[in-house]
Amino acid sequence: AMDLILINSLPLVSDAETSLTCIASGWRPHEPITIGRDFEALMNQHQDPLEVTQDVTREWAKKVVWKREKASKINGAYFCEGRVRGEAIRIRTMKMRQQASFLPATLTMTVDKGDNVNISFKKVLIKEEDAVIYKNGSFIHSVPRHEVPDILEVHLPHAQPQDAGVYSARYIGGNLFTSAFTRLIVRRCEAQKWGPECNHLCTACMNNGVCHEDTGECICPPGFMGRTCEKACELHTFGRTCKERCSGQEGCKSYVFCLPDPYGCSCATGWKGLQCNEACHPGFYGPDCKLRCSCNNGEMCDRFQGCLCSPGWQGLQCEREGIPRMTPKIVDLPDHIEVNSGKFNPICKASGWPLPTNEEMTLVKPDGTVLHPKDFNHTDHFSVAIFTIHRILPPDSGVWVCSVNTVAGMVEKPFNISVKVLPKPLNAPNVIDTGHNFAVINISSEPYFGDGPIKSKKLLYKPVNHYEAWQHIQVTNEIVTLNYLEPRTEYELCVQLVRRGEGGEGHPGPVRRFTTASIGLPPPRGLNLLPKSQTTLNLTWQPIFPSSEDDFYVEVERRSVQKSDQQNIKVPGNLTSVLLNNLHPREQYVVRARVNTKAQGEWSEDLTAWTLSDILPPQPENIKISNITHSSAVISWTILDGYSISSITIRYKVQGKNEDQHVDVKIKNATITQYQLKGLEPETAYQVDIFAENNIGSSNPAFSHELVTLPESQAPADLGGGKMLL
């Protein structure tokens, strides 16, 4: 509900500054609050436009301030108006000269239909003139000069709504400037009644609250709150939830509070007088000090709050036993909440006694919409209301208000909600590579639409035309490999970005489709690669028996290790070998093979081989003679790769003997790099030569090596390493 309050400070204008302040408490008006002159109430008042400014001390408040030199232009009737969701509330008030000839008993007077009413003005200046009384600027009554009493009265024995209006009194020779004003508010219904036909019964509006004739709700005086105005506010506070505060040194002194009709204007609790600058006499409290304390157990009477009950007692007169009421307090509600658009379940938690019920807790959106709890629970000390907004959107950002209204009072806590747009990638992910059971994906998570920061990223994928749920993997890098996919299957892919906070999963981005490769046949078995000539290699394999009717062939890929030369050869599936020709002599080649149908098969392991050499082999290198004994010695060597070396020959003879007396040892395994010579003579010098042989011929040794055996019984010398042929 709208809580609009007009503070008139001061209604009696002298030479001091005077003002009107209009406050929209606890809600945000859709249109600006307006303050204007009320020509309905007083037609012939000053026409000057008002200088309305923002009240810097409050968020939603407007103010008009008149400096002392403007005093002559102030007299008249004013209004403040606020609107929210089509509903308008207008509050009226008046200002008059303190030096007027008459002064009203009260600024406003609220009566019920049918009441016996006396509107009274006190004579302040004595003049030899007739007194005149006007209603809404029109003459209604005069009193001859000799009969003007100290209290000038308009008597309405049976007040009707049409009697309502601004009544003014002055001497006939005066003018608006010397007039006194009072406003009569006549409730459309008789006492305790409300409704369009006035046949419903009001709840009790305590502490001089007034029952609204249209809704049956109580309008509570400044300083009291709750459904029946039973609860006193904290000292010097006012408003429907008591969250507005009087900033003066003496609290709300000199503040006349005007509320929507039928309330009218009054002082805050604890003050009385036309200027609200007189404190209540002992034993009295409330607005205009009209309420009398009748505290049951002799408790103290506070002029602001009434009876201050002893522990264990409650009620206006401390007449009821029970736990004293405690104004509700809203707890654990942060000032600022960041929310992701979508479903939102705000929580409002409150303490107090009695504990607030679910009917007493509401949430007000920035546009004024009132939400009621979807769920509710309470512990010994707290009530927790859970609200549900099925789809909160960025326009819902702004000040929300948690409101709690119990018999013990009302409290509101505004908090700011910032609604974030969920992130969504602008581009579909890209497929970099695929196989029959994997795909390499660039997720293309940026750029994205919506709000960051991005907390995590998900790659979603599923086969097309399958009624399967989307599978997902969490990804940290932009490049990701999807494994365990089905072969020859069309998949769709998209990326979902997640921002911080509950419900931070954005909508998946654009979809990319791709198809995995068909599963391949296994590679040929028994693969063997051998050199055939200087320019050919021969690749052989076992016969292939395919499991399906599909045509197949063998694909052979060969590439040179030394050069960037690659060739792929297709071989009919019924063959078991292929001659790789047009090769370069003395070159190493890497070969692999696979069996292809419509789908490509799996590659075999790499096989390597050298073509036969076109030159004599180089001499073995690093020849060492070691481990010499009286009858043996170990010879080791290394050979260079790539010369098709097929064997090594070791030739030795006793030094000085004829050439034809040598012994040749032929080692046909070219991978062996060590040999032990045995059966040598002790203390004998030998000449040792070593050759490498290939398809062209033998290497030419540049020099011979000498070996001298040891005498018998001496320990061997020099241990060698490497492969040894014994």
Epitope: G86, Q192, G195, E197, H200, L201, T203, M206, D214, E230
Partner: antibody, heavy 117, light 113 residues
Framework: QVQLVQSGGGVVQPGRSLRLSCAAS????????MHWARQAPGKGLEWVAV????????YYADSVKGRFTISRDNSKNMLQLQMNRLRSEDTAVYYC??????????WGQGTVITVSS | DIQMTQSPDSLAVSLGERATINCKSS????????????LAWYQQKPGQPPNLLMY???TRESGVPDRFSGSGSGTDFTLTISSLQAEDVAVYYC?????????FGQGTRLEIK
């Protein structure tokens, strides 16, 4: 938590009297007007009577006027409905209720009155 | 007295579907001074007292799920349940409080199809 607990139902012969009670807790009873409504078996709801917060004003449905009396004891947080000269058409579940404006917000659990010879 | 007439008397709707209950008053319950409709809606489940759902024709009572909504003005009003749930099976009543005595509609029984 506001609660209205009803008592006093039963079977009664036509022409006889019965008194229904409604005990209120969790609210300042003396601040609220109170209502009685009823519901005949298998039928809809019918408003019966209302009493103002101070007991000064009372209104009745035409069907019960002159036979039923609504009253309250604010010191005991108690609402009563004295039903005299009962008729068979008064057979119903009777509810006490607190208003929210003109709607009835909190209802008692209901008490069954059967008027039968 | 203002007469309230509901239609239909009973209604069967599938779970998740929309349910609509109408209420007509014999005279307008719209008060022009404040543009408010003095109409309430209640839900009553077997063996329980009625439960206030709506007042001022369209203001949801605390704790009432937002699938319930009220609309209409003057003499013709509608209670809508946007997506029927199993727990919504009940009898629904409209009530005017424009004028005393307050009067109720005869009720609409809502069941699941």
């Amino acid at each position: 938590q506001v609660q209205l607990v009803q008592s006093g139902g039963g079977v009664v012969q036509p022409g006889r009297s019965l008194r229904l009670s409604c005990a209120a807790s969790g609210l300042t009873f003396s601040n609220y007007a109170m209502h009685w409504a009823r519901q005949a078996p298998g039928k809809g709801l019918e408003w019966v009577a209302v009493i103002s917060y101070d007991g000064e004003n009372k209104y009745y449905a035409d069907s019960v006027k002159g036979r039923f009396t609504i009253s309250r004891d604010n010191s005991k947080n108690m609402l009563q409905l004295q039903m005299n000269r009962l008729r068979s058409e008064d057979t119903a579940v009777y509810y006490c209720a607190t208003p929210k404006g003109g709607a009835l917000e909190i209802w008692g659990q209901g008490t069954v009155i059967t008027v039968s010879s | 007295d203002i007469q309230m007439t509901q239609s239909p008397d009973s209604l069967a709707v599938s779970l998740g579907e929309r349910a609509t209950i109408n209420c007509k008053s014999s005279q307008s319950v719209l008060y022009s001074s404040n543009n408010k409709n003095y109409l309430a809606w209640y839900q009553q489940k077997p063996g329980q007292p009625p439960n206030l759902l709506m007042y001022w024709a369209s203001t949801r009572e605390s704790g009432v799920p937002d699938r319930f909504s009220g609309s209409g003005s003057g003499t013709d009003f509608t209670l809508t349940i946007s997506s029927l749930q199993a727990e919504d099976v009940a009898v629904y009543y409209c009530q005017q409080y424009y004028s005393a005595p307050i009067t109720f509609g005869q009720g609409t029984r809502l069941e699941i199809k």
